[in-house]
C-alpha cells in the first residue's frame, strides 16, 4: 500500500510540476495583461479607432478602447454607449473592408501591442504589457479631466495662475461633468506589432497590425512654407479635440509652451526615467493608484519653447500628481523568465532525485534484494515499484 501511494505521489509531483512549467511557458499568452478596476465614463466614438476585449483570465470583463491618439481606456461592455461605440467601429471596419481598405478584423482575445509606449495611466489600472520588441515605455499623462487648454504648460505645474477669458485653463474637473474618470491605461506607439484585436475600426495600410489611420495619399502641392505637414482628404481617421475652455483632461498630455527646467516639472516625470534604459523585451508592470484629486491647477499661456517630447519620444510624464500615484515596476524580461524556468526544471529534477532516493531507501528497508535496484539507462535508473513487482519507475541518477 505504502509503495503505491509513494509512486502515486511521485506521479502527482511530476504532473504538477510539468503543469506549472507548461503554464509558465504559456504565461505570456494567456495571463491577464490589462486589469481594469475602474471603467471610463463616456468617450465619443469619433475619438475611437479600435476596441478589444480583455482576456477571459482577467475575470472582470471589460472593453479596452483605443483613442485616435493611441491611448487605452477600460470601458464597461454593459453600458449602452460602449455597445453603440463597438457597433459603430464594427460598421466602420466593414465599410472600409468593402471599400477595399486593408483593415484586418482580428478575432481573439487581446494580447496588447508589443510595444506599449508613452501614454497616460489612470487610477485603478494594472497593466502588464509583454514586450517582445522595442523598448517599452509608458508615459503617464494628466488626468485632470477638464484642465483648460493652458497653453500647453505641464499639468503637474501648480502655477496658481487664474486665466482670463481667452486663456485655456482648467474649469471644473471632468468628474463633475461626466467625462471619463480615472481610467486611462497607456498610450500605444504609432507603430507596433502583433496585437490581436477582437474588433476595431478601419485599418490603414502600413506595417502595423493596428489602424494607424495615416493618410496614404500623395501630399498635395503646397507652398514651401507649408511643407511641414500635410493631410489630404482621401484618407479618413477619427481624431479630434474639444471646445470651450482649452481643456486637457484625462488622457491628454499637452506639450508645454514654456521653457521651464525639468526640475520644475514636479516629481512625476522622475517615474518615467526608469523606462529610458529598458532594453528590448522589457515588460512593465504598472500599477496606478489613486491619490487625492481635489483640484486642477490653473495654467496660463506662455511663449514658445517646447519642453515635452512628442508622442514618439517616450520619456517624461505629464500627469496630475494630485490625482495619481504611479507605481512603475520593471518586470524581468524574457531571458529572466527563461532563467526562472531553468531553475524550476532543476528544482523539479532535484525533487525527483530526492523522491527516488527516498523510495530506494524505503524499498531497501522493506528488504528488497539489492540486485533488484534496477539498470541504468541514459542517466535514469529503473526502480521496481515493489519487491515482487515487474513494473518500474524512472528516477534520475
Amino acid at each position: 500500500m505504502a509503495p503505491i501511494s509513494l509512486s502515486w505521489l511521485l506521479r502527482l509531483a511530476t504532473f504538477c510540476h510539468l503543469t506549472v512549467l507548461l503554464a509558465g511557458q504559456h504565461h505570456g499568452v494567456t495571463k491577464c495583461n490589462i486589469t481594469c478596476s475602474k471603467m471610463t465614463s463616456k468617450i465619443p466614438v469619433a475619438l475611437l479607432i479600435h476596441y478589444q476585449q480583455n482576456q477571459a483570465s482577467c475575470g472582470k470583463r471589460a472593453i479596452i478602447l483605443e483613442t485616435r491618439q493611441h491611448r487605452l481606456f477600460c470601458a464597461d461592455p454593459k453600458e449602452q454607449w460602449v455597445k453603440d461605440a463597438m457597433q459603430h467601429l464594427d460598421r466602420q471596419a466593414a465599410a472600409l473592408t468593402r471599400n477595399g481598405g486593408t483593415f484586418e478584423k482580428q478575432i481573439g482575445e487581446v494580447k496588447p501591442r508589443t510595444t506599449p509606449a508613452a501614454g497616460g495611466m489612470d487610477e485603478s489600472v494594472v497593466l502588464e504589457p509583454e514586450a517582445t520588441g522595442e523598448s517599452s515605455s509608458l508615459e503617464p499623462t494628466p488626468s485632470s479631466q477638464e484642465a483648460q487648454r493652458a497653453l500647453g504648460t505641464s499639468p503637474e505645474l501648480p502655477t496658481g495662475v487664474t486665466g482670463s477669458s481667452g486663456t485655456r485653463l482648467p474649469p471644473t474637473p471632468k468628474a463633475q461633468d461626466g467625462g471619463p474618470v480615472g481610467t486611462e491605461l497607456f498610450r500605444v506607439p504609432p507603430v507596433s506589432t502583433a496585437a490581436t484585436w477582437q474588433s476595431s475600426a478601419p485599418h490603414q495600410p502600413g506595417p502595423s497590425l493596428w489602424a494607424e489611420a495615416k493618410t496614404s495619399e500623395a501630399p498635395s502641392t503646397q507652398d514651401p512654407s507649408t511643407q511641414a505637414s500635410t493631410a489630404s482628404s482621401p484618407a479618413p481617421e477619427e481624431n479630434a479635440p474639444s471646445e470651450g475652455q482649452r481643456v486637457w483632461g484625462q488622457g491628454q498630455s499637452p506639450r508645454p509652451e514654456n521653457s521651464l527646467e525639468r526640475e520644475e516639472m514636479g516629481p512625476v516625470p522622475a517615474h518615467t526615467d526608469a523606462f529610458q534604459d529598458w532594453g528590448p523585451g522589457s515588460m512593465a508592470h504598472v500599477s496606478v493608484v489613486p491619490v487625492s484629486s481635489e483640484g486642477t491647477p490653473s495654467r496660463e499661456p506662455v511663449a514658445s519653447g517646447s519642453w515635452t517630447p512628442k508622442a514618439e519620444e517616450p520619456i517624461h510624464a505629464t500627469m496630475d500628481p494630485q490625482r495619481l500615484g504611479v507605481l512603475i515596476t520593471p518586470v524581468p524580461d524574457a531571458q529572466a523568465a527563461t532563467r526562472r524556468q531553468a531553475v524550476g526544471l532543476l528544482a523539479f529534477l532535484g525533487l525527483l532525485f530526492c523522491l527516488g532516493v527516498a523510495m530506494f531507501t524505503y524499498q531497501s528497508l522493506q528488504g528488497c534484494p539489492r540486485k533488484m535496484a534496477g539498470e541504468m539507462a541514459e542517466g535514469l535508473r529503473y526502480i521496481p515499484r515493489s519487491c515482487g513487482s515487474n513494473s518500474y519507475v524512472l528516477v534520475p541518477v
Epitope: 471610463t40 463616456k42 468617450i43 465619443p44 466614438v45 469619433a46 475619438l47 483613442t67 485616435r68 491618439q69 491611448r71 481606456f73 449602452q80 454607449w81 453603440d84 459603430h88 479631466q145 477638464e146 487648454r149 497653453l151 500647453g152 481667452g166 486663456t167 485655456r168 471632468k174 461633468d177 461626466g178 467625462g179 471619463p180 486611462e184 489611420a213 495615416k214 493618410t215 511641414a228 505637414s229 493631410a231 489630404s232 482628404s233 479618413p236 481617421e237 477619427e238 481624431n239 479630434a240 479635440p241 474639444s242 471646445e243 470651450g244 475652455q245 482649452r246 481643456v247 486637457w248 483632461g249 484625462q250 488622457g251 491628454q252 499637452p254 506639450r255 508645454p256 499661456p301 517646447s306
Partner: antibody, heavy 122, light 107 residues
Framework: EVQLVQSGAEVKKPGATVKISCKAS????????IHWVQQAPGKGLEWMGW????????KFNERFKGRVTITADKSTNTAYMELSSLRSEDTAVYYC???????????????WGQGTTLTVSS | DIQMTQSPSSLSASVGDRVTITCRAS??????LAWYQQKPGKAPKLLLY???TLSGGVPSRFSGSGSGTDYTLTISSLQPEDFATYYC?????????FGGGTKLEIK
C-alpha cells in the same frame, strides 16, 4: 489669449483651387486639432474635417473628401485648407476652429477664426 | 451620419422671456452635444457642451438638458444680446453634424 486669424476673402472661378490660411496663437499649435467648418449663405454649418498639425491622420467629411487638403506649417503656427475643383455651391464662409486634444471629451469647438468668405463665380 | 433637427427654425420673443430651443438627433449621441450662438457676420460662439457644461464666460441663464436623442437649450430670461441664431452640434460620431439653426428675433 487664444486666437485664430484667417486669411482674407477670395473670389475664384469654377474649377479653380483656393487655399485659406488660419494662423494660431496663444497655445501650443501642435497639441490641438484644427477643424474646418463651411457655412453657405443662409445655410447652416457643415463640418469639413479635422487635422492635428504634425500628425498625418486627418479625418474628412465624405462630402468634401477628395477635394480637400489640410496642411500646416508648424514654424508659423498656420493651418491651411485647400479646396479644389471649385463649384458655385462652394460659395460660403469657411471657419477654422479648434478643440482640445483631450482624448475623452470630444470635439466641441471652443475657438473659432473670424471666417473667410469664398465666392465662386464665373 | 447622424442628422440633427432643430426646432423651431425661428422664434420671436421679448426681453425677459424664457425661451426653449430643441434639437433632435437621428440616433443616440450619448449627451455629446454642443450649443453655439452666432450673430450676423461673426463666428459661432460655444455656449454649452457635453452633459450641459457651461462654457467659460457664458451667463448662467443659458442651460441645457436632455438625453438619448432629444436635447433642449433654455434661456431663462432673454437679454437684448441674446438675439442671435443658435445651433446644436453632435460630436458623438463623425461626420460631426449641426442642426439647421434657430433664429431668435425680438418680438
Amino acid at each position: 489669449e487664444v486666437q485664430l486669424v484667417q486669411s482674407g476673402a477670395e473670389v475664384k472661378k469654377p474649377g479653380a483651387t483656393v487655399k485659406i490660411s488660419c494662423k494660431a496663437s496663444g497655445y501650443t499649435f501642435t497639441n490641438y486639432y484644427i477643424h474646418w467648418v463651411q457655412q453657405a449663405p443662409g445655410k447652416g454649418l457643415e463640418w469639413m474635417g479635422w487635422y492635428l498639425p504634425g500628425d498625418d491622420s486627418p479625418k474628412f467629411n465624405e462630402r468634401f473628401k477628395g477635394r480637400v487638403t489640410i496642411t500646416a506649417d508648424k514654424s508659423t503656427n498656420t493651418a491651411y485648407m485647400e479646396l479644389s475643383s471649385l463649384r458655385s455651391e462652394d460659395t460660403a464662409v469657411y471657419y477654422c476652429a479648434t478643440s482640445p486634444t483631450d482624448e475623452t471629451q470630444g470635439d466641441y469647438f471652443d475657438y473659432w477664426g473670424q471666417g473667410t468668405t469664398l465666392t465662386v463665380s464665373s | 451620419d447622424i442628422q440633427m433637427t432643430q426646432s423651431p427654425s425661428s422664434l420671436s420673443a421679448s426681453v425677459g422671456d424664457r425661451v426653449t430651443i430643441t434639437c433632435r438627433a437621428s440616433g443616440r449621441i450619448h449627451d455629446f452635444l454642443a450649443w453655439y450662438q452666432q450673430k450676423p457676420g461673426k463666428a459661432p460662439k460655444l455656449l454649452l457642451y457635453t452633459d450641459n457644461t457651461l462654457s467659460g464666460g457664458v451667463p448662467s441663464r443659458f442651460s441645457g438638458s436632455g438625453s438619448g436623442t432629444d436635447y433642449t437649450l433654455t434661456i431663462s430670461s432673454l437679454q437684448p444680446e441674446d438675439f442671435a441664431t443658435y445651433y446644436c452640434q453632435q460630436f458623438w460620431s463623425t461626420p460631426y453634424t449641426f442642426g439647421g439653426g434657430t433664429k431668435l428675433e425680438i418680438k
